[in-house]
């Protein structure tokens, strides 16, 4: 969370951003809020990116003003126009690219004053892993697959019964480049699996952490997975 203030005194407003991460090829949100105004016509939102000459996005007098927008963002940005009056200046970024990573500034002008705050935006790829029993293998084996990751993540196996055990000797992880030559498919195999145990496949890079769990008993198999973005650094 980053809170920025405008110039001192009555002519400053509080602008708040939250560091976030974008999944390349998908849509992302750059979060920014400010002290609301009662007049839409008095609100100006400017999004800028460090090292980029043109504007990322500008919204003024109740509509987008894109005459000075940088080419790299053309057709890919939008604010939530119906929420600007509430103090929501968040930017929707379509089709996130690796090159969208960097430092952004959310700059706000209202009739109450001015304010800005910076936001660190990371880009990469992350996806939910799925853990299955590999029936083709000669011994009891689990296979953990996740279709899209970048940068290359680490994969760690854990088990509920053997807590703290190191499974690196009985697992094998491979990374296969996807067709767009950036993201990779992650496949990790765990051997010598015992019945009546819960195993977790944990995939992590500097952007996201995802876990796929599987519980194998004689009568059933239960799966669960979740993904967490590692972007909640307060500053």
């Amino acid at each position: 969370l980053i809170i920025g203030f405008g110039i001192s005194g009555r002519h400053s407003i509080t602008v708040t951003t939250v560091a976030s991460a974008g999944n390349i090829g998908e849509d992302g949100i750059l979060s920014c809020t400010f002290e609301p105004d009662i007049k839409l016509s008095d609100i100006v939102i400017q999004w800028l990116k460090e090292g980029v000459l043109g504007l990322v996005h500008e919204f003024k007098e109740g509509k987008d003003e894109l005459s000075e927008q940088d080419e790299m963002f053309r057709g890919r940005t939008a604010v939530f126009a119906d929420q600007v009056i509430v103090g929501n200046a968040s930017l929707r970024l379509k089709n996130v690219q690796l090159t969208d990573a960097g430092t952004y500034k959310c700059y706000i002008i209202t009739s109450k004053g001015k304010g800005n705050a910076n936001l660190e935006y990371k880009t990469g790829a992350f996806s939910m892993p799925e853990v299955n029993v590999d029936y083709n293998a000669s011994s009891e084996t689990l296979r953990c697959e996740a279709p899209r990751w970048f940068p290359q993540p680490t994969v760690v196996w854990a088990s509920q019964v053997d807590q703290g055990a190191n499974f690196s000797e009985v697992s094998n992880t491979s990374f296969e480049l996807n067709s767009e030559n950036v993201t990779m498919k992650v496949v990790s195999v765990l051997y010598n699996v015992t019945i009546n145990n819960t195993y977790s496949c944990m995939i992590e890079n500097d952007i996201a952490k995802a876990t796929g769990d599987i519980k194998v008993t004689e009568s059933e198999i239960k799966r669960r997975s979740h993904l967490q973005l590692l972007n909640s650094k307060a500053s």
């Epitope: 009662i38 007049k39 007098e61 119906d82 929420q83 009056i85």
Partner: antibody, heavy 117, light 106 residues
Framework: QVQPQQSGAELARPGASVKLSCKAS????????MQWVKQRPGQGLEWIGA????????RYTQKFKGKATLTADKSSSTAYMQLSSLASEDSAVYYC??????????WGQGTSVTVSS | DIVLTQSHKIMSTSVGDRVSITCKAS??????VAWYQQKPGQSPKLLIK???YRYTGVPDRFSGSGSGTDFTFTISSVQAEDLAVYYC????????FGGGTKLEIK
């Protein structure tokens, strides 16, 4: 639950002043505009002005400058509107409304002001 | 100040009918228009925000459209409980309200 509570009905003499209150609860009082609206019997809605309790910033429509004074007490989460030099045309129901977002989302129940000699 | 004109003071309709109320702004207000319902003896209630976004908990028979200077509020199938006065309001500049349209049920 967000529901502004307004003070009771007022009966005042011409030339006098009244101070209406609007107590907020269920949200952060300092970060949303509090608006005031007038409605004369059988008539439409008329915006008076608004106050941002966080810093006391006020806005008035031209007609009510000098007639209405908006204040806010952060410690009690209460907004006030003082109406001065009352005349018969000030007889109306006065609403406070929280500008929670987009528009006037939450309205008080209204305070009736009757100006009569 | 921006003037909002609701051309019909009173509209008569029957239960089940579709009814549209119009609101015209004296200048461009983008989509910064809200619609309110006020039933007799009650405070106004927000129905539509930013011209076309239905407010939380509002039945989907209520809808809004328009941008710039011309706005329309529609009830697709009028119910008996919709008897009320409907107001448009702009927040592009200092807020102003339309004169209101009273919906009567035949």
């Amino acid at each position: 639950q967000v529901q502004p509570q307004q003070s009771g009905a007022e009966l005042a003499r011409p030339g006098a002043s009244v101070k209406l209150s609007c107590k907020a609860s269920g949200y952060t009082f300092t970060t949303y505009w509090m608006q005031w609206v007038k409605q004369r019997p059988g008539q439409g809605l008329e915006w008076i002005g608004a106050i941002y309790p966080g810093d006391g910033d006020t806005r008035y429509t031209q007609k009510f400058k000098g007639k209405a004074t908006l204040t806010a007490d952060k410690s009690s989460s209460t907004a006030y509107m003082q109406l001065s030099s009352l005349a018969s045309e000030d007889s109306a129901v006065y609403y406070c409304a929280i500008n929670w977002g987009y528009a006037m989302d939450y309205w008080g129940q209204g305070t009736s002001v009757t100006v009569s000699s | 100040d921006i003037v909002l004109t609701q051309s019909h003071k009173i509209m008569s309709t029957s239960v089940g009918d579709r009814v549209s109320i119009t609101c015209k702004a004296s200048q461009d207000v983008r989509t910064a228009v809200a619609w309110y319902q006020q039933k007799p003896g009650q405070s106004p209630k927000l129905l539509i925000k930013s011209a076309s976004y239905r407010y939380t908990g509002v039945p989907d028979r209520f809808s809004g459209s328009g941008s710039g200077t011309d706005f329309t509020f529609t009830i697709s199938s009028v119910q008996a409980e919709d008897l009320a006065v409907y107001y448009c309001q702009q927040h592009y500049s200092n807020p102003t309200f339309g004169g209101g349209t009273k919906l009567e049920i035949k």
